[in-house]
Interface confidence: low
C-alpha cells in the first residue's frame, strides 16, 4: 500500500542503491518513487551532519521485506517511496530554496530580475535540468541577479552548498510547464544519431519513449524492432542526448524506430507507467515470486500490489495452470526494463501499474455573510 | 481572496471552479477535486439552485477568461448536501458533488489529499486559501486564480471575534488579527489547503465570515477533519468503493 | 407563522403591464429560493419564473421569457414579477413559493401563497 | 424541456379503495419528483418529494414510489378528504408539472 508518512531524526541503515544530493527531503523521496528499485529513501538535511560530503545526502534503498532498521540520527528525515501512492507520483517539484546554490554544468548565463523568472528559462530550455539565481544582495556584485542554467549526469545537483542570496531550484518542464512544445510523431524505419546515455529492453517503441521521458538526460530515442537483423539489439531502447538538444543527423533504417522524449509537452505528459499487456511474449528478471492466478490481468494486479514487483509474465502452458488459474511470474531488474524478451511463448506479458498515477490506490495518510 | 497573489499553472490542481449557465454564465463558488468523480464543496452554494443541470465545473484552469464554449466542463451527476445543514445557519456547510463522469488525473487536474478523522494533533503552519472570488469586499470575481498565505486562528479566539456566532468544533477559522488577507465572495466551497511534511492537505471549506478581510474577523472554514465519517459514507455507498484520497 | 401574501392582480388588457408583489413573514427572506407558479383556470399548474436567494440570477419558463421580470428586495422581504406584454393566456391565478427545509436540494415547494389573479381580456 | 405526463386524467373512486396514479417524465430526473394535493380555490399542498419521501404531517396512507421515467403515487385506503387534483411535478432540470389527476367520488 501507500505509506507517506516521514520519520523525523530517523536514518535507514543498510540497503543503499543509489545516493545523489537533493536539496530537500521530499525531492529525495520523489527520486526514490521513480527509482526502479527503491521502496525507502533517508536524507541528511544540512544541520544533520558536519561531514560536508554528505550534507544534503538522499539515500535511495531497496529491502526484500520492504523495510529497513532505523535508527536514530538527529536531523535526519527517512520515509517511503510513493510507489503505489496514485495521484501522488509526480515528478514535478515547484519549491525554490533559498540560500542554497545547486551545483552542476553551468551551461548559460544570463541577467534576470527574478528567480520565478530563471526558473521559467530553465522550464524553457531544453537541456536545463536546475539552476540557480543570485539575489539583489549577493556579496558580489557583478553576479547579482544571474540566472545560471545547469544540467549533470545524473539530473540531480554534483554538490549542493549552502550560500547566502543565492536561491536554487528545478525545471517545471516535469510539471507540464515547458513552453518549448514537443514532437509527438513517431518515424518509423529511422534511426537517430548522436550519444547514448542508457540502453533497456523495452517491448514497443511507446514504451521506449515514455522512459525516455522520464530519464533524466534523455531528449530522444531510437527503438529496435524485435525483427531487426542483429539478434541480440531487438528490443533494444537507446535513449539519446546531443549538445543541441535535437539529433544531429538521422539515418533511414529498416525495423528501427525513432522519436522524442514528451518531456517539454505543454499542458500533458504521458504516465509514468505502461499498462498495455503483451500477449505471446516472455519478459525475463530476477525471480521475485510465483502465484497461481485466474487471468492476465489478476496476474498484472499481483504485481501492481507487490511493491518490488516491476513486470510480470504470465503462462499458460499446460503445466503451469491448475483448472482455471495459471501461474503469474512476478519479476524485477536493475533497471525496472526486462533483461529478456521472447517472443512466440505460451502467454502474455506486461508491467506494474504502480507508478500509474490515475489509479485509486493512492492514499494519503495522516452564517453571516457566505461567500 | 483579499490581498493574494496570482496563482500558476497547476500550483493548486485540486481546484475547480462551480458555475452556472443559465442565459448567461458564471462563477458561483469553488470546490476541491478529491477524487476521479468527486468535488468537496460548500452547501450555501445551492442555496438556491438546486437544479443540477445548470451546474458547470471547470478543473484544470486558471484563468477564468480562458474559458470558451469549447472549454470542457463536468456536470453534476449528484449533489449531496450535508443532512444537518440548514440554509439559515452555517453549520455543517459542506456538500459532496459527484461528476457524471470520471476525470482523469493531470499535473493540473488531481486530487487534494483529505486529513485524517478527527485531526487535531497536526499543527498547521502553512495554509493557504484558493479562489476566484472578489478582492474586496464590494468587488468582483478574479479572473486569475488567487492565493493567500493566511495562519490558522484558535476556536476559543475566533469565537472572540464572532460573538453572535457560536463557532464549534467542526468549524476552523484563519486571519491575521490586522486582517487584509481572506477569502471572500465567490471563493466559497473552495479549499483552505495546509502543507504538512511535504504534504498537502484539505483542512478546510470556504465557508464565511464578517465581510472580507476584516481586522479582527478571521474567515470562517468546514473542518473537512470532523466530516471524515460522512465523506467516506456518502462517497462509498454511492458506488461501494471508496473514490477520494481518504486517510489510511 | 410563516406567510406569504401576494397582491397587485386585476385586470388588464392584452399587450399591457402588472407588477405583482408577494409579501413574506415569519422566515428569513433573504435565505431562500423564491418561485412564482400559476394556474389558468380549470388548468394545472406551470411554474413561471425563479429567483435565487441574493437575487443575483434568475430563471424563467420559456412562454414567459423576455416579458416576465422576477426581483426582490430582500429588506422589505417582498419577492415581485413584472408582466409586460401581456397576452390573454396569461390569465391566471399566480402564486408564490419557496422550500422551507434547510436541504435546497429537495426543491419541491412546501410553502404557497393563497394567490392574486391575473385576467388579460379586452 | 422536459415533460410530464399524468394518468388518468380523472380517476372515480369509492371510500377505503387502493388508488394508483402513474407520472411519465420524457427523460430521466432520477428521484426529483414531487406530488401535490390541490382543492378548488385552494394552494396545492405538497405531499411527497423525492419520489417517496413523505412530507412531514402527510397522512401515512400517501406513498410515493419510482425513479428515472416512471412514477406512481398511491393511496392505500381513500379517505373523504382525498377527493381532490393531484400533479406531479419533476425538478431535475427546472420545475414542470404534469397535468393534473382529478379524484372524484365513484
Known amino acids: 500500500g501507500c505509506l507517506t508518512q516521514l520519520y523525523e531524526n530517523a536514518f535507514f541503515r543498510g540497503g543503499d542503491v543509489a545516493s545523489m544530493y537533493t536539496p530537500n527531503a521530499q525531492y529525495c523521496q520523489m527520486r526514490c518513487t521513480f527509482h526502479p528499485r527503491c521502496l525507502l529513501f533517508s536524507f541528511l538535511p544540512a544541520s544533520s551532519i558536519n561531514d560536508m560530503e554528505k550534507r544534503f545526502g538522499c539515500f535511495l534503498k531497496d529491502s526484500v521485506t520492504g523495510t529497513l532498521p532505523k535508527v536514530h540520527r538527529t536531523g535526519a528525515v527517512s520515509g517511503h517511496s510513493l510507489k503505489q501512492c496514485g495521484h501522488q507520483i509526480s515528478a514535478c517539484h515547484r519549491d525554490i530554496y533559498k540560500g542554497v546554490d545547486m551545483r552542476g554544468v553551468n551551461f548559460n548565463v544570463s541577467k534576470v530580475s527574478s528567480v520565478e523568472e530563471c526558473q521559467k528559462r530553465c522550464t524553457s530550455n531544453i537541456r536545463c535540468q536546475f539552476f540557480s539565481y543570485a539575489t539583489q544582495t549577493f556579496h558580489k556584485a557583478e553576479y547579482r541577479n544571474n540566472c545560471l542554467l545547469k544540467y549533470s549526469p545524473g539530473g540531480t545537483p554534483t554538490a549542493i552548498k549552502v550560500l547566502s542570496n543565492v536561491e536554487s531550484g528545478f525545471s517545471l518542464k516535469p510539471c507540464a510547464l515547458s513552453e518549448i512544445g514537443c514532437h509527438m510523431n513517431i518515424f518509423q524505419h529511422l534511426a537517430f544519431s548522436d550519444v547514448d546515455v542508457a540502453r533497456v529492453l523495452t517491448p514497443d517503441a511507446f514504451v521506449c519513449r515514455t522512459i525516455c521521458t522520464y530519464h533524466p538526460n534523455c531528449l530522444f530515442f531510437t527503438f529496435y524492432t524485435n525483427v531487426w537483423k542483429i539478434e541480440s539489439q531487438r528490443n533494444v531502447c537507446l535513449l539519446k542526448t546531443s549538445e543541441s538538444g535535437t539529433p544531429s543527423s538521422s539515418t533511414p533504417q529498416e525495423n528501427t524506430i525513432s522519436g522524442y522524449s514528451l518531456l517539454t509537452c505543454k499542458r500533458t505528459l504521458p504516465e509514468p507507467c505502461h499498462s498495455k499487456i503483451y500477449p505471446g511474449v516472455d519478459f525475463g528478471g530476477e525471480e521475485l515470486n510465483v502465484t497461481f492466478v485466474k487471468g492476465v490481468n489478476v496476474c498484472q494486479e499481483t504485481c501492481t500490489k507487490m511493491i518490488r514487483c516491476q513486470f510480470f509474465t504470465y503462462s499458460l502452458l499446460p503445466e503451469d495452470c491448475k483448472e482455471e488459474k495459471c501461474k503469474c511470474f512476478l519479476r524485477l531488474s536493475m533497471d525496472g526494463s526486462p533483461t529478456r524478451i521472447a517472443y512466440g511463448t505460451q502467454g502474455s506479458s506486461g508491467y506494474s501499474l504502480r507508478l500509474c498515477n490515475t489509479g485509486d490506490n493512492s492514499v494519503c495518510t495522516t452564517k453571516t455573510s457566505t461567500r | 481572496i483579499v490581498g493574494g497573489t496570482n496563482s500558476s499553472w497547476g500550483e493548486w490542481p485540486w481546484q475547480v471552479s462551480l458555475q452556472v449557465k443559465l442565459t448567461a454564465q458564471r462563477h458561483l463558488c469553488g470546490g476541491s477535486l478529491i477524487g476521479h468523480q468527486w468535488v468537496l464543496t460548500a452547501a450555501h452554494c445551492f442555496d438556491g439552485l438546486p437544479l443540477q443541470d445548470v451546474w458547470r465545473i471547470y478543473s484544470g484552469i486558471l484563468n477564468l477568461s480562458d474559458i470558451t464554449k469549447d472549454t470542457p466542463f463536468s456536470q453534476i451527476k449528484e449533489i449531496i448536501i450535508h443532512q444537518n445543514y440548514k440554509v439559515s445557519e452555517g453549520n455543517h456547510d459542506i456538500a459532496l458533488i459527484k461528476l457524471q463522469a470520471p476525470l482523469n488525473y493531470t499535473e493540473f487536474q488531481k486530487p487534494i489529499c483529505l486529513p485524517s478523522k478527527g485531526d487535531t494533533s497536526t499543527i498547521y503552519t502553512n495554509c493557504w486559501v484558493t479562489g476566484w472570488g472578489f478582492s474586496k469586499e464590494k468587488g468582483e470575481i478574479q479572473n486569475i486564480l488567487q492565493k493567500v498565505n493566511i495562519p490558522l486562528v484558535t476556536n476559543e479566539e475566533c469565537q472572540k471575534r464572532y460573538q453572535d456566532y457560536k463557532i464549534t468544533q467542526r468549524m476552523v477559522c484563519a486571519g491575521y488579527k490586522e486582517g487584509g488577507k481572506d477569502a471572500c465572495k465567490g471563493d466559497s466551497g473552495g479549499p483552505l489547503v495546509c502543507k504538512h511534511n511535504g504534504m498537502w492537505r484539505l483542512v478546510g471549506i470556504t465557508s464565511w465570515g464578517e465581510g472580507c478581510a476584516r481586522r479582527e474577523q478571521p474567515g470562517v472554514y468546514t473542518k473537512v477533519a470532523e466530516y471524515m465519517d460522512w465523506i467516506l459514507e456518502k462517497t462509498q455507498s454511492s458506488d461501494g468503493k471508496a473514490q477520494m484520497q481518504s486517510p489510511a | 407563522e410563516v406567510q406569504l401574501l401576494e397582491s397587485g392582480g386585476g385586470l388588464v388588457q392584452p399587450g399591457g403591464s402588472l407588477r405583482l408583489s408577494c409579501a413574506a413573514s415569519g422566515f428569513t427572506f433573504s435565505h431562500y429560493i423564491m418561485m412564482w407558479v400559476r394556474q389558468a383556470p380549470g388548468k394545472g399548474l406551470e411554474w413561471v419564473s425563479g429567483?435565487?436567494?441574493?437575487?443575483?440570477?434568475?430563471v424563467y419558463a420559456d412562454s414567459v421569457k423576455g416579458r416576465f421580470t422576477i426581483s426582490r428586495d430582500n429588506s422589505k422581504n417582498t419577492l415581485y414579477l413584472q408582466m409586460n406584454s401581456l397576452r390573454a393566456e396569461d390569465t391566471a391565478v399566480y402564486y408564490c413559493?419557496?422550500?422551507?427545509?434547510?436541504?435546497?436540494?429537495?426543491?419541491?415547494?412546501?410553502?404557497w401563497g393563497q394567490g392574486t389573479m391575473v385576467t388579460v381580456s379586452s | 424541456d422536459i415533460q410530464m405526463t399524468q394518468s388518468p386524467s380523472t380517476l372515480s373512486a369509492s371510500v377505503g379503495d387502493r388508488v394508483t396514479i402513474t407520472c411519465r417524465a420524457s427523460?430521466?430526473?432520477?428521484?426529483?419528483l414531487a406530488w401535490y394535493q390541490q382543492k378548488p380555490g385552494k394552494a396545492p399542498n405538497l405531499l411527497i418529494y423525492?419520489?417517496?419521501t413523505l412530507e412531514s404531517g402527510v397522512p401515512s396512507r400517501f406513498s410515493g414510489s419510482g425513479s428515472g421515467t416512471e412514477f406512481t403515487l398511491t393511496i392505500s385506503s381513500l379517505q373523504p378528504d382525498d377527493f381532490a387534483t393531484y400533479y406531479c411535478?419533476?425538478?431535475?432540470?427546472?420545475?414542470?408539472f404534469g397535468q393534473g389527476t382529478k379524484v372524484e367520488i365513484k
Open positions: 423525492k419520489a417517496s
Open positions: 411535478q419533476q425538478y431535475n432540470t427546472y420545475w414542470t
Open positions: 413559493a419557496y422550500r422551507r427545509t434547510g436541504v435546497p436540494r429537495w426543491d419541491a415547494f412546501d410553502i
Open positions: 429567483i435565487y436567494s441574493s437575487g443575483g440570477i434568475t
Open positions: 427523460q430521466s430526473i432520477s428521484s426529483w
